[in-house]
C-alpha cells in the first residue's frame, strides 16, 4: 500500500478506510464497522470482515466423510463481537440478548441461550473441509494438476503456508480441500486457516475481498474450474456442545 494519499489503499481488504496518517506518515487502514487497524500485508481476520460486511449498506483419492462433530455455518451472517486482536469473542449475543458460543471461525458451537450463558474459551477450529462441486467439463481434471493448482492458490493468493493444506481429494465432480492447523503449529505471522477459507469462500462466490484485483480465475492446465456448489465443514479441537434435540432434528 502506498503513502501517496490518492493511492493509500489496502490490497488485502477492500472493506477498509485508509489514510497516510499512521506513524511517520505510514499508510494506515482501518476496517469498516470496527474501526480497527488492519495489517494490509496479510489477510484480515474473518471477525473483522464479517463486522465490516454487516456495517456496509445492504492423498488417497477417496472423499472425506465429515465427522459427526463437524459444524456447518447454517446461521449465516451476524454482526460479531471481535477482541482487540480481531478474533471472535467466545460468546456472541444479538440485540435481543440471545447468546451462543462460537469457535475460532465464528461458527456457533452450542445451543442458543440467554445472557447467563458462559463460554469459557475460544475453541480453535483445527480442521476445515472445503467441499466443492465443479460444473460439468469435457472430462475429469487431472488430480495432480488440480492438487498443484489449489495448493498454489492457497499459497500465493491467501499466503497460507503449504504445510496447512493437508490434502486435496477429487472424485469428479467433487473436490475437497482439507486445511489443518493446530494451535501448536500456528506461529506468529501465519495466516489462520479460518481466514484463508473465508477469503476462498468469498472468491468462489464472486465476492472477492481483495482491493482492485480481478475476481478469482481458477484454471487447471488452462481449463476453467467453475464451482457451482460450496459446503464448508469445521472441526474444532473440542467437540461442540449441542442438546440431543438439535442432534435428532
Amino acid at each position: 500500500h502506498t503513502a501517496a494519499q490518492d493511492n493509500c489503499t489496502c490490497p488485502t481488504n477492500k472493506m477498509t478506510v485508509c489514510s497516510p496518517d499512521g506513524p511517520g506518515g505510514r499508510c494506515q487502514c482501518r476496517a469498516l464497522g470496527s474501526g480497527m487497524a488492519v495489517d494490509c500485508s496479510t489477510l484480515t481476520s474473518k471477525c473483522l470482515l464479517l463486522k465490516a460486511r454487516m456495517s456496509a449498506p445492504k492423498n488417497a483419492r477417496t472423499l472425506v466423510r465429515p465427522s459427526e462433530h463437524a459444524l456447518v455455518d447454517n446461521d449465516g451472517l451476524y454482526d460479531p463481537d471481535c477482541d482487540p486482536e480481531g478474533r471472535f469473542k467466545a460468546r456472541q449475543c444479538n440485540q435481543t440478548s440471545v447468546c451462543w458460543c462460537v469457535n475460532s471461525v465464528g461458527v456457533r458451537r452450542t445451543d442458543k441461550g440467554d445472557l447467563s450463558l458462559r463460554c469459557d474459551e475460544l475453541v480453535r477450529t483445527h480442521h476445515i473441509l472445503i467441499d466443492l462441486r465443479h460444473r460439468p467439463t469435457a472430462g475429469a481434471f487431472n488430480h495432480s494438476d488440480l492438487d498443484a493448482e489449489l495448493r498454489r492458490l492457497f499459497r500465493e493468493r491467501y499466503r497460507l503456508h503449504p504445510k496447512f493444506v493437508a490434502a486435496v481429494h477429487y472424485e469428479q465432480p467433487t473436490i475437497q480441500i482439507e486445511l489443518r492447523q493446530n494451535t501448536s503449529q500456528k506461529a506468529a505471522g501465519d495466516v489462520d486457516i479460518g481466514d484463508a477459507a473465508y477469503y476462498f469462500e468469498r472468491d468462489i462466490k464472486g465476492e472477492s475481498l481483495f482491493q482492485g484485483r480481478g475476481g478469482l480465475d481458477l484454471r487447471v492446465r488452462g481449463e476453467p474450474l467453475q464451482v457451482e456448489r460450496t459446503l464448508i465443514y469445521y472441526l474444532d479441537e473440542i467437540p461442540p456442545k449441542f442438546s440431543m434435540k438439535r442432534l435428532t432434528a
Epitope: H1, T2, A3, A4, Q5, D6, C8, S19, P20, D21, G22, P23, G24, G25, R26, C27, D39, S41
Partner: antibody, heavy 120, light 107 residues
Framework: QVQLVQSGAEVKKPGASVKVSCKAS????????INWVRQATGRGLEWMGW????????GYAQKFQGRVTITADESTSTAYMELSSLRSEDTAVYYC?????????????WGQGTMVTVSS | DIQLTQSPSSVSASVGDRVTITCRAS??????LAWYRQKPGKAPKLLIY???SLQSGVPSRFSGSGSGTDFTLTISSLQPEDFATYYC?????????FGQGTRLEIK
C-alpha cells in the same frame, strides 16, 4: 527531481522561538506527510513530529508536546516547524523528511538539515 | 514508547568484510522497521524499509531481515563508502523512534 530544501542556520537566545522551513519540489506536496527529526551534535536521531498537509492532521512526540508546532502552506509547498521556549539542549540539526512512496513509514527523502544554535 | 536497541554500538571492519548489525525492539513491531546510513554532516539515507525491502538505488550488498522484535542489517562486502553510522527506525506506533546508532569504523 524530488527534493526538500530547508532554510538556513539560526542562532537563538534561550526562551526564544525558531521557525524552520522546508520547501518541497518534484512531487505533489499534499500527497505525502512531512516529518521532523533532529540530531544534536554527536548524538542520535530524534523524531519530533509529523503533519499530513492535505488533512491538516498532526502528531508530536510527547517530549515536544506544547512546544512544537508543525504547519504547512499548500500554495508554496512548504512545511514549517516552530519550536518555542528554546533551551541550550535544543541546539541541533533539524531535518524535514518525507515518507516513502511504499507507505511504510520509512523516510526516503530528507532535507539538507538546518543548524539551530541556542546560546546566550 | 517503543525502544530500539542496536548492537554493537560500534564495530571495526575492513573493506570486503561481511558485517551484521542488530536492532531489538522493546515490543513487537511486525515488519515496520527501516535502516539508514548516515555519513558525517549529511542527512540519513534510507537503505531498507519494511524490514527487508531494498530501497531503490541501494546496492544489493545491503539486506535486512527479521520481524516482531529482532531485526538484522547485513552488509555482505563492505565498500569504502559504507564506513558511517547506521540507524534503525520503527513505524509501528507513535511516536516514531530510532535506535541509538551503530558506528562502523575502518579497522
Amino acid at each position: 527531481q524530488v527534493q526538500l530544501v530547508q532554510s538556513g542556520a539560526e542562532v537563538k537566545k534561550p526562551g526564544a522561538s525558531v521557525k524552520v522551513s522546508c520547501k518541497a519540489s518534484g512531487y505533489t506536496f499534499t500527497n505525502y506527510g512531512i516529518n521532523w527529526v533532529r540530531q544534536a551534535t554527536g548524538r542520535g536521531l530524534e523524531w519530533m513530529g509529523w503533519m499530513n498537509p492535505r488533512s491538516g492532521n498532526t502528531g508530536y512526540a510527547q517530549k515536544f508536546q506544547g512546544r512544537v508546532t508543525i504547519t504547512a502552506d499548500e500554495s508554496t509547498s512548504t512545511a514549517y516547524m516552530e519550536l518555542s521556549s528554546l533551551r541550550s539542549e535544543d541546539t541541533a540539526v533539524y531535518y524535514c523528511a518525507r515518507p516513502n512512496t511504499g507507505g511504510d513509514g520509512a523516510f526516503d527523502i530528507w532535507g539538507q538539515g538546518t543548524m539551530v544554535t541556542v546560546s546566550s | 514508547d517503543i525502544q530500539l536497541t542496536q548492537s554493537p554500538s560500534s564495530v571495526s571492519a575492513s573493506v570486503g568484510d561481511r558485517v551484521t548489525i542488530t536492532c531489538r525492539a522493546s515490543q513487537g513491531i511486525k515488519s515496520w522497521l527501516a535502516w539508514y546510513r548516515q555519513k558525517p554532516g549529511k542527512a540519513p539515507k534510507l537503505l531498507i524499509y519494511r524490514a527487508h525491502s531494498l530501497q531503490s538505488g541501494v546496492p544489493s550488498r545491503f539486506s535486512g531481515s527479521g520481524s516482531g522484535t529482532d531485526f538484522t542489517l547485513t552488509i555482505s562486502s563492505l565498500q569504502p563508502e559504507d564506513f558511517a553510522t547506521y540507524y534503525c527506525q520503527q513505524a509501528n506506533s507513535f511516536p516514531v523512534t530510532f535506535g541509538q546508532g551503530t558506528r562502523l569504523e575502518i579497522k
